[in-house]
Structure formats: structure tokens, C-alpha cells
Interface confidence: medium
């Protein structure tokens, strides 16, 4: 008869490597008499015999994990006890090995140039996979801007246009390699004007094409503004090549204007905009009368008929092809601009403009025009049209109009001769002399300086209140 024998584990447990979803087996061979009771623990917790994930055979000597999971990692021990002597134990580790798996793959990204982009790539695997990235067909090299983070994510600082493309991450360990799907990195670029429209100085009735070129991703749209109003698309020709949009605005010039090219593109819910402006001026509107050659003739036009002295000889500038027509056309266009001014300003401005464009003339060997007297010009500026003049100059300061004179052929008062230097060298405005009699009905002008009279503006009991800088004594 056999003698009782305490249990001895003849094959100690070893470390077992197992792949996820595969079978893992621990062998615990025991010699003893009587036959021992064998129990199993995982991380010191008893494995229940009825747990369907395990199979225990050969009198408990064989533990099989039927489908290994990540969480099965740990220390497995078999404990043998037959009542003879003490219980014996042998332990071994289960190392769950795992082919690389990408748990958080990268996704398509749209990013604005200059910002930071992060493409995620979170992985699982045992041994821990190494992560690399492919752009297009080539391995991506890290540099000062581009780095693969510990997590596997790809970080790109200061994103550039050339970073755009298709990316995938690659997770690799000794058991295999996993690839993410291809994702697209799109780099968006704020709209930027490459070529601004050029300003033009042209003759009335000329044709001008303004050109504006812009770049951006997505390709911007270009719109045009004429003196604050949108321009109809019928006159705009556009072409797009290599993300550059070229827009040409065709114009027929009948009045000066400010034309603004606006390039816009959209980034998500936000828009980026770039602007450039050009002025189109009409050459004849700003021509200096200085040293100009011309002839003296009776005014035969219509616009200034009621303003100019009857049968007066006026100066016609032969630098125009057809001086009488050209000057009449200028005053006619100016008249349209005056439609918006106040009833106080309009007749004074009409008197000023007519006498400026059709200057009184003393025909001699060389016909000479007589400019308006400075004091009368200032009276219009500072008194009759003070509000309009201020608004006009405000627009000029904000860059809305070239020269401070808005769209009218207005003289620069400071450059005109004073009637006190030589009363015969300049022209008075009879309308202002007449109106001056009722000056008390006009609003006074507030000035930061004390008010003073314009001296000797044809003798009268009343005077114009303007600042002393204009008292040209």
C-alpha cells in the first residue's frame, strides 16, 4: 500500500506569452498521495471552476484560458493540497501579446496656415508599438516644426501650404504592423491680394480696366465696390489658375471714383477679407490753370448762363481739344454733384464753380484768365458751404477721395490771389456781394479761434465771420 506523500510540483509554472483571442495554457504537474486538490488564482484571486472563460482539466493540473483578452494579463498560481504536509504553490505570469492596433485613428483636418495642427494616432499593442507617419508615399521626417508625440499623434507647428496632403500613421511591433486609413490635411490660407488695382487719370468717356489678383485657400471670391456701391457682375471678367483669382473690372469713365477690390474666402464659419483700392480721376477735372494757353470768348453755354455776367468774356483753355464743349461738360457733371448740397450752399457753390471753370478774361496779346479772389472762395468754404466742405475734407482724410475736393473742380482757396494785394488781379463773385446784405440770416461759423472779418469784402455794414488766418491784409 502506498505511503502518503505531500504534494510536490514537478513542473513549476512558467511565463506564458499569448496573443489576444488565442488560447493560453498553464501546466501544473503535481506528484502526491493521495491525489491533491488543485486550485488556481489570478493576481491572488481564486478562479471559479464554473467561469466559462477557463477550462481546468487533468485533475486541475491544466488551466486553459480559452480566448485571451488584454485584461487576462497577470500572475497565475496553482495551489496543491492533499492534507499531507502543507499546501504547495507555483506561480507564473501571463503576458498578453498584442499585434498593434490603432484605437484612435487620425481624421481629416482643415487648418489655417500658421496655426498648429495635431493628427491623433493612439495605439495599443504589446510590445508597445512604435508609431511613424507617412505623407503621400514617403516616410515623414521629423524636424523643428514636425514631431511625433509620445502618444503617437503628429504635431505640426506653424502649418505651411506645403504640409497639405494625405497622411497615415503606422503602428509597428514584433508581432505585426497596423496602418490607419489615409486622411487629408487641408491647409487654408487667408485671402491676400497679390496685385492691387492701379489708379488712373483719364479723359472723360475713356474706357479703363481695373485688375485685381488675389490668392487664398479656398480660392477667394472677388467683388468690386464703386464709391461705396456694389458693382454689377456683368462688367467683371474672372479667371482662376493655381488658386489665384484674377478679376478685371471694365469701366466707362464719366465721373471720378474710388474703386475697391475685396477678396474674401471662408474658413469654417468665419471669413477672411483683403481689400485694395484705386482711384479713377478725370484729367480735365484737376488741370491747373497756371500758364495755360487759351482764348477769350463770350460764354455760349447753358449751365452757367444765369451765374456769369451777361456778355462777359471768359477764358477757354486750349489744352482741351474742344475747350468750350469740354469746360461745359465739366461744369455739367459738377452740377449733378451739387444736387445733394443745402439750399444755402448750392447757389454760392454754383457761383464759385462757374467763375472758376469760366474765368473772367482780359483779352490782350496773351489772353489771361482772372482767378477768383481768395476772400470770396473762403466765404463759400467757411460760410455758405462750411458743413459740406467739412464733410468733403473728412472724406479726403479717410482716404476716400484723392485731393480734398471730393468730386468737384473746386479751387484751392489758399492758392488764389487776395483782392487786397491787387483788386484788378482777381474776380469777385457778385452773388456773394448781394447775399452779404442779408448775412444775419445765415448760421454763424464756430471756430476754435476768435472770429474776424474778411477785410473789405466789398464795403458793407456786414461781414463774414471766418478765422483770422484768412484775413489777408
Amino acid at each position: 500500500e502506498k505511503l502518503p506523500k505531500a504534494p510536490v510540483i514537478t513542473t513549476p509554472l512558467e511565463t506564458v506569452d499569448a496573443l489576444v483571442e488565442e488560447v493560453a495554457t498553464f501546466m501544473c504537474a503535481v506528484e502526491s498521495y493521495p491525489q491533491p486538490e488543485i486550485s488556481w488564482t489570478r493576481n491572488k484571486i481564486l478562479i471559479k471552476l464554473f467561469d466559462t472563460r477557463y477550462s481546468i482539466r487533468e485533475n486541475g493540473q491544466l488551466l486553459t484560458i480559452l480566448s485571451v483578452e488584454d485584461s487576462d494579463d497577470g500572475i497565475y498560481c496553482c495551489i496543491a493540497n492533499n492534507g499531507v504536509g502543507g499546501a504547495v504553490e507555483s506561480c507564473g505570469a501571463l503576458q498578453v501579446k498584442m499585434k498593434p492596433k490603432i484605437t484612435r485613428p487620425p481624421i481629416n483636418v482643415k487648418i489655417i496656415e500658421g496655426l498648429k495642427a495635431v493628427l491623433p494616432c493612439t495605439t495599443m499593442g504589446n510590445p508597445k508599438p512604435s508609431v511613424s507617419w507617412i505623407k503621400g508615399d514617403n516616410a515623414l521626417r521629423e524636424n523643428s516644426r514636425i514631431a511625433v508625440l509620445e502618444s503617437g499623434s503628429l504635431r505640426i507647428h506653424n502649418v505651411q501650404k506645403e504640409d497639405a496632403g494625405q497622411y497615415r500613421c503606422v503602428a509597428k511591433n514584433s508581432l505585426g504592423t497596423a496602418y490607419s486609413k489615409l486622411v487629408k490635411l487641408e491647409v487654408e490660407v487667408f485671402a491676400r491680394i497679390l496685385r492691387a488695382p492701379e489708379s488712373h487719370n483719364v479723359t472723360f468717356g475713356s474706357f479703363v480696366t481695373l485688375r485685381c489678383t488675389a490668392i487664398g485657400i479656398p480660392v477667394p471670391t472677388i467683388s468690386w465696390i464703386e464709391n461705396g456701391n456694389a458693382v454689377s457682375s456683368g462688367s467683371i471678367q474672372e479667371s482662376v489658375k493655381d488658386r489665384v483669382i484674377d478679376s478685371r473690372l471694365q469701366l466707362f469713365i464719366t465721373k471720378p471714383g474710388l474703386y475697391t477690390c475685396i477678396a474674401t474666402n471662408k474658413h469654417g464659419e468665419k471669413f477672411s477679407t483683403a481689400k485694395a483700392a484705386a482711384t479713377v480721376s478725370i484729367a480735365e477735372w484737376s488741370k491747373s490753370q497756371k500758364d495755360s494757353q487759351g482764348y477769350c470768348a463770350q460764354y455760349r453755354g447753358e449751365v452757367c448762363d444765369a451765374v456769369l455776367a451777361k456778355d462777359a468774356l471768359v477764358f477757354f483753355n486750349t489744352s482741351y481739344r474742344d475747350p468750350e464743349d469740354a469746360q461745359e461738360l465739366l461744369i455739367h457733371t459738377a452740377w449733378n454733384e451739387l444736387k445733394a448740397v443745402s439750399p444755402l450752399c448750392r447757389p454760392a457753390a454754383e457761383a464759385l464753380l462757374c467763375n472758376h471753370l469760366f474765368q473772367e478774361c482780359s483779352p490782350g496779346v496773351v489772353p489771361t484768365p482772372m482767378p477768383i479772389c481768395r476772400e470770396y472762395c473762403l466765404a463759400v468754404k467757411e460760410l455758405f458751404c462750411a458743413k459740406e466742405w467739412q464733410a468733403m475734407e473728412g472724406k479726403a482724410h479717410r482716404g476716400l477721395y484723392r485731393s480734398g475736393m471730393h468730386l468737384l473742380p473746386v479751387p484751392e482757396c489758399s492758392k488764389l490771389p487776395s483782392m487786397h494785394r491787387d483788386p484788378t488781379a482777381c474776380t469777385r463773385l457778385p452773388y456773394l456781394d448781394y447775399k452779404k446784405e442779408n448775412i444775419t440770416t445765415f448760421p454763424s461759423i464756430t471756430s476754435s479761434r476768435p472770429s474776424a472779418d474778411i477785410p473789405n469784402l466789398p464795403a458793407s455794414t456786414s461781414s463774414f465771420a471766418v478765422s483770422p488766418a484768412y484775413s489777408m491784409t
Epitope: 456683368g234 466707362f252 464719366t254
Partner: antibody
Framework: QVQVQESGPGLVKPSQTLSLTCTVS??????????WSWIRQPPGKGLEWMGV???????YYSPSLKSRTSISRDTSKNQFSLHLSSVTPDDTAVYYC?????????????WGQGTQVTVSS | SYELTQSPSVSVALRQTAKITCGGN??????VQWYQQKPGQAPMLVIY???RRPSGIPERFTGSNSGNTATLTITGAQAEDEADYYC??????????FGGGTHLTVL
């Protein structure tokens, strides 16, 4: 005194290109103050501006005809031409060439007598 | 394109005043031309820049333009004034537009 005169075929088949020439005498088509337009008038209807060539050769077209219209010039002959592609019977009209002058607010101050063009197969 | 509206016909008694209108959005800010066209003839410029007459055009033809309406006035209409009249503007964007035309009948 400037004179303008249209010339070209009186009959054009549908889908073909209509070509007309305007000869200018008494003034140059490159003179700075002038532009040269084509204007047509379908039978019993009003005037329709088609396009213009400016003194510097730049061209501008009516938005409704832009895709089919082309205007060119031959400065050596002092002529400018209209080409209208893919014509249909709706293009049957009297075609005028006219001068636009900066001296008269770019109005058309000189007109040709007009040439009748019929589009029919 | 810019829409110009003209009434199709206007009648006037001989030597009376005829008014032909041309409507357009804020036309007062544009330069309006008027052309006269008699049957079988090319159009002829009668008014430019709203109210100016080319040389050779009788003084009875006058023009005005403000707000949304330009007007051609023929004071003391003559039999020879019976014709079609067209208004015309240039858009700032290099395209010209004509009104549909008004036939003036002198009774």
C-alpha cells in the same frame, strides 16, 4: 466730318458666325476722344447696344451677348469689325456702327446708314 | 444691365409741347442722351449730357434729368418731329443701355 459705313453679307445661315466691318473716314479710330460701337435693331424693335472698341483697342461687350461677341480692329485700314458666333434667326436685324465721342458725353454722334442682316437657312 | 423704361407712344398736336420720359433707378445721377430715328434712317443724336444740344438741332428740343426720370421736351412740335425717340445711358461699367423707344405722333 467723320463718316462710318457698315459692310458685310446680308444673309447668314443659323449656327454660323456673322462678320461685319465698319470703315471710318474723316477721322482715326485711334483718336483718344472716341470709341466705336456696334448697335443693332431687330425688325420693328428698339436699339440694342452690342459692344465697343476704345481708342486703345480695349473691348467691352453687352453682358447678354458677351459669350458670342467679338470686336476687333485694323488700324492700317481704319476699320473695326464685329463677329457674332452661333447666330439664330433672333439675330436678324439692321446692324449699325457708330462713333461715341467724349466731346458729347460719349454719345453716339455719327452713325452708319445700317446694314440689313437676315439669319435664315 | 440698367433698365430704362419709355412709354411706347406719345401724341402731340402740331405746335404743342410734347414730353417723352425715360425712367430708370436714380437716373438723375447719370448722363442721358436722346436719339431721334425716322423710318428707314439711322438714329440721330438730339440731346446729350441730359440737356445739351448738338449743333444743328433746333432749339425746340430740350432735355432735363433728375431723380428717377429724364425728360425730352419738344416745344412747338413740328410735323417733321414725328419719329421714334430713344434714351440712352452709359453704365459706369462699360456697357450702354437704350430705352425701348417712344413713337411720337404729331397730330
Amino acid at each position: 466730318q467723320v463718316q462710318v459705313q457698315e459692310s458685310g453679307p446680308g444673309l447668314v445661315k443659323p449656327s454660323q458666325t456673322l462678320s461685319l466691318t465698319c470703315t471710318v473716314s474723316g477721322g482715326s479710330i485711334t483718336a483718344r476722344y472716341y470709341s466705336w460701337s456696334w448697335i443693332r435693331q431687330p425688325p420693328g424693335k428698339g436699339l440694342e447696344w452690342m459692344g465697343v472698341i476704345a481708342y486703345d483697342g480695349s473691348t467691352y461687350y453687352s453682358p447678354s451677348l458677351k459669350s458670342r461677341t467679338s470686336i476687333s480692329r485694323d488700324t492700317s485700314k481704319n476699320q473695326f469689325s464685329l463677329h457674332l458666333s452661333s447666330v439664330t434667326p433672333d439675330d436678324t436685324a439692321v446692324y449699325y456702327c457708330a462713333r461715341g465721342s467724349s466731346r458729347v458725353a460719349a454719345a453716339f454722334d455719327s452713325w452708319g446708314q445700317g446694314t440689313q442682316v437676315t439669319v435664315s437657312s | 444691365s440698367y433698365e430704362l423704361t419709355q412709354s411706347p407712344s406719345v401724341s402731340v398736336a402740331l405746335r404743342q409741347t410734347a414730353k417723352i420720359t425715360c425712367g430708370g433707378n436714380r437716373i438723375g445721377g447719370k448722363s442721358v442722351q436722346w436719339y431721334q430715328q425716322k423710318p428707314g434712317q439711322a438714329p440721330m443724336l438730339v440731346i446729350y449730357a441730359d440737356s445739351r444740344r448738338p449743333s444743328g438741332i433746333p432749339e425746340r428740343f430740350t432735355g432735363s434729368n433728375s431723380g428717377n426720370t429724364a425728360t425730352l421736351t419738344i416745344t412747338g412740335a413740328q410735323a417733321e418731329d414725328e419719329a421714334d425717340y430713344y434714351c440712352h445711358v452709359w453704365g459706369s461699367t462699360a456697357s450702354a443701355d437704350f430705352g425701348g423707344g417712344t413713337h411720337l405722333t404729331v397730330l
